[in-house]
């Protein structure tokens, strides 16, 4: 039997199954336990959960068969309606041991929150039991096969299934998804919806206009041959109950990225600049790498651009091998699979002063015996502009004798080109080296000049000066 929802009210209005006398009041109990029995009565002196005297196997074979009464087999109704159904059974007094009726759905027992009531109708011959089940505001998840189970004399009895079919508007189990596509390149969109009722037919919609004149059975795959601009796609799912529209998805056309929106100069040294940037819009395609373009800001330069390529992430790069104390213009662009962004606006950055690249020249060392000091003289090295402004010199002097080693250094201001150092150890060798200092750091030390400090007043030094290098161009 199949019951449409218009007939549902009749389910409990007809005559009760079996042989119930007129005007007989039933005992009712909510279904909260699997072992619900009627209250003690004539012919059923044993209370619930109490074993009745065992009948012999021969006697068992003589017991009439017990089965659930035939009931409605198929209920069809719309979502959000209420539904009630039941199963009933007549149990003769000859059966000594019964357990309560339990409800099952699709092979799993229904416990807890489900609304069910079991009613008992005792008479002289036995008891009729009706298990009522109701669902308020049915949902699709209530679809399924419901049946009753009961144990009678240790034998499990199962009712025929009652198939509940909740019908409604089509329900999407796969909706189209947003994708980013290459211009004029084919791509697929998928849409799948289910009932009941089936069948479900699909119409595709692009920018509010239907794509297919004839509907396709669900599931449907739409092949779009290619787009030249962003479009919005959705699908309509139709069944006998009506229409459901999927979410609209944007299909974006991949384009070149936008240039970075910010560039930050994080740190500068004499020969490097650390830059970071904030990528612009990626053009609907992941950024693959970025390019840092660097040119000398000095207008006199020939304008050649140095290009440093780096990965797109992290958005950070240390530009190296730059000249000291120089002004640079820097711009950044990034690339995705479509192509390169425009470059960012050019920004300015400077390297700091470098350290001197040459040592002081013409170093001479004399021992002033009367004052017990070393007199050291040199000439200023040819310091380039980018080496920075000379701030002074560092003089390293190392004293070595039989059992002593002493390493000392002095710093002198840039004004002079000579210095005096007190003699530290007699009968020793003193090695002197000098380096120039700018704000950018300390330059290389000169070649060592050795002088022997005698025990007495005899002086013998060698060599006490360094020749000037061949090329002193600045």
């Amino acid at each position: 039997e199949k019951w449409e929802e218009t007939e549902l009210d009749q389910l409990f209005s007809g005559p009760l199954p079996g042989r119930l006398p007129v005007n007989h009041r039933p005992f009712s109990a909510p279904h909260s336990s699997r072992d619900q029995l009627p209250p003690p009565q004539t012919g059923r002196s044993h209370p619930a959960h109490t074993a009745a005297p065992q009948v012999t196997s021969t006697a068992s074979k003589l017991l009439p068969p017990v089965a659930f009464n035939h009931t409605i087999g198929h209920i069809v109704l719309s979502e959000h309606k209420n539904v009630k159904f039941n199963c009933s059974i007549n149990i003769p007094n000859t059966y000594q041991e019964t357990a309560g009726i339990s409800w099952w759905k699709d092979g799993k027992e229904l416990l807890g929150a489900h609304h069910s009531i079991t009613q008992f109708y005792p008479d002289e011959e036995g008891v009729s039991i009706i298990a009522l089940f109701s669902i308020a505001s049915v949902q699709r998840s209530d679809n399924g096969s419901y049946f009753c189970k009961m144990k009678v004399n240790n034998r499990e009895i199962v009712s025929d299934p009652i198939y509940v079919e909740v019908q409604g508007l089509p329900y999407f189990i796969k909706q189209p998804e947003s994708v980013n596509v290459t211009r004029n390149t084919a791509f697929n969109l998928t849409c799948q919806a289910v009932g009941p009722p089936e069948p479900v037919n699909i119409f595709w919609v692009q920018n509010s206009s239907r794509v297919n004149e004839k509907p396709e059975r669900s599931p449907s795959v739409l092949t779009v041959p290619g787009l030249t601009e962003t479009a919005v796609f959705s699908c309509e799912a139709h069944n006998d109950k009506g229409l459901t529209v999927s979410k609209g998805v944007h299909i974006n056309i991949k384009v070149i990225p936008s240039p970075p929106t910010e560039v930050h100069i994080l740190n500068s040294t004499a020969h490097s600049i650390l830059v970071s940037w904030v990528p612009g819009f990626d053009g609907y395609s992941p950024l693959q790498n970025c390019s840092i373009q660097v040119k000398e800001a000095d207008r006199l330069s020939n304008g050649s651009v140095m290009v440093f390529n780096t990965s797109a992430s992290p958005h950070l790069y240390e530009i190296q091998q730059l000249q000291a104390l120089a002004n640079y213009s820097i711009a950044v662009s990034c690339r995705n699979e479509i192509g390169w962004s425009a470059v960012s606006p050019w920004i300015l950055a400077s390297t700091t002063e470098g350290a001197p690249s040459v040592a002081p020249l013409n170093i001479t060392v004399f021992l002033n015996e009367s004052n017990n000091i070393l007199d050291i003289r040199w000439t200023k090295p040819p310091i380039k502009r980018q080496d920075g402004e000379l701030v002074g010199y560092r003089i390293s002097h190392v004293w070595e004798s039989a059992g002593t080693y002493k390493e000392l250094s002095e710093e002198v201001s840039q004004n002079g080109s000579w210095a005096q150092i007190p003699v530290q150890i007699h009968n020793a060798t003193c090695t002197v080296r000098i380096a120039a200092i700018t704000k950018g750091g300390i330059g290389p030390f000169s070649e060592p000049v050795n002088i022997i400090i005698p025990e007495h007043s005899k002086v013998d030094y060698a060599p006490s000066s360094t020749p000037a290098p061949g090329n002193t161009d600045s």
Epitope: T261, E262, P345, I347, L348
Partner: antibody, heavy 128, light 111 residues
Framework: EVQLVESGGGLIQPGGSLRLSCAAS????????MSWVRQAPGKGLEWVSI???????YSASWAKGRFTISKDNSKNTLYLQMNSLRAEDTAVYYC??????????????????????WGQGTLVTVSS | DIQLTQSPSTLSASVGDRVTITCQSS????????LSWYQQKPGKPPKLLIY???DLASGVPSRFSGSGSGTEFTLTISSLQPDDFATYYC???????????FGGGTKVEIK
């Protein structure tokens, strides 16, 4: 649609405080610097403050200590907290997207390249 | 304080006229070209017209052009249209300073 919508303006007494909001849509504040600019009735434009994508802030010298720019990336909203308001703060306050910005972290300053998107503005009137 | 001075402050012109507005800075603009021009109509927010002294913003008609470098900049409207009657502002940034300076504005009105 890419747009900016300011709110929070109104009549306020001198000495009072007000917080302006600017809701951005169509782009992300987490990847764009943002700025506030004001315009007194019948007067020209005056820059107030900027916040970089990472949250570094810079303000006009006259605004320091009284006006604070901030943002909530999760809400994609820019704010301007204005305290100790004066009659001369009466103006239409615009939020604007910074098209490009260069920051010099070591020297604690940054420079706006251009303001490429503006909101409709919200009027703040400071009067007793 | 760094100042951007626009001239003239008011300009009367007719449709079809060639219009030139100048903007002078008291100090060199950052990178010599980080100067922008904005157009503002009554009751409306400003709109970016030109950046980098001479680059046209997206959607701006080609009758608008900009030129200049360092401290002297010019906005030119080659043939004034009815939609162009508005107030124009120059603006720029400077090295070593976060301030974004606006010029005083030039009102272009119908003659």
């Amino acid at each position: 649609e890419v747009q900016l919508v300011e709110s929070g303006g109104g009549l306020i007494q001198p000495g009072g405080s007000l917080r302006l909001s600017c809701a951005a849509s169509g782009f992300s504040l987490s990847s764009n610097a943002m700025s506030w600019v004001r315009q007194a009735p019948g007067k020209g434009l005056e820059w107030v403050s900027i916040i970089s994508s990472s949250g570094s802030t810079y303000s006009a010298s006259w605004a320091k200590g009284r006006f604070t720019i901030s943002k909530d990336n999760s809400k994609n909203t820019l704010y301007l907290q204005m305290n100790s308001l004066r009659a001369e703060d009466t103006a239409v306050y615009y939020c604007a997207r910074v098209g490009f910005f260069v920051g010099y972290g070591a020297y604690d300053y940054g420079i706006i390249h251009r303001l490429d998107l503006w909101g409709q503005g919200t009027l703040v009137t400071v009067s007793s | 304080d760094i100042q951007l001075t626009q001239s003239p402050s008011t300009l009367s012109a007719s449709v079809g006229d060639r219009v030139t507005i100048t903007c002078q800075s008291s100090k060199s603009i950052y990178n010599n070209n980080w100067l922008s021009w904005y157009q503002q109509k009554p009751g409306k927010p400003p709109k970016l017209l030109i950046y980098d002294a001479s680059d046209l913003a997206s959607g701006v008609p080609s009758r608008f052009s900009g030129s200049g470098s360092g401290t002297e900049f010019t906005l030119t409207i080659s043939s004034l249209q009815p939609d162009d009657f508005a107030t124009y502002y120059c603006a720029g940034g400077y090295s070593g300073d976060s301030d974004y300076a606006f010029g005083g504005g030039t009102k272009v009105e119908i003659k």
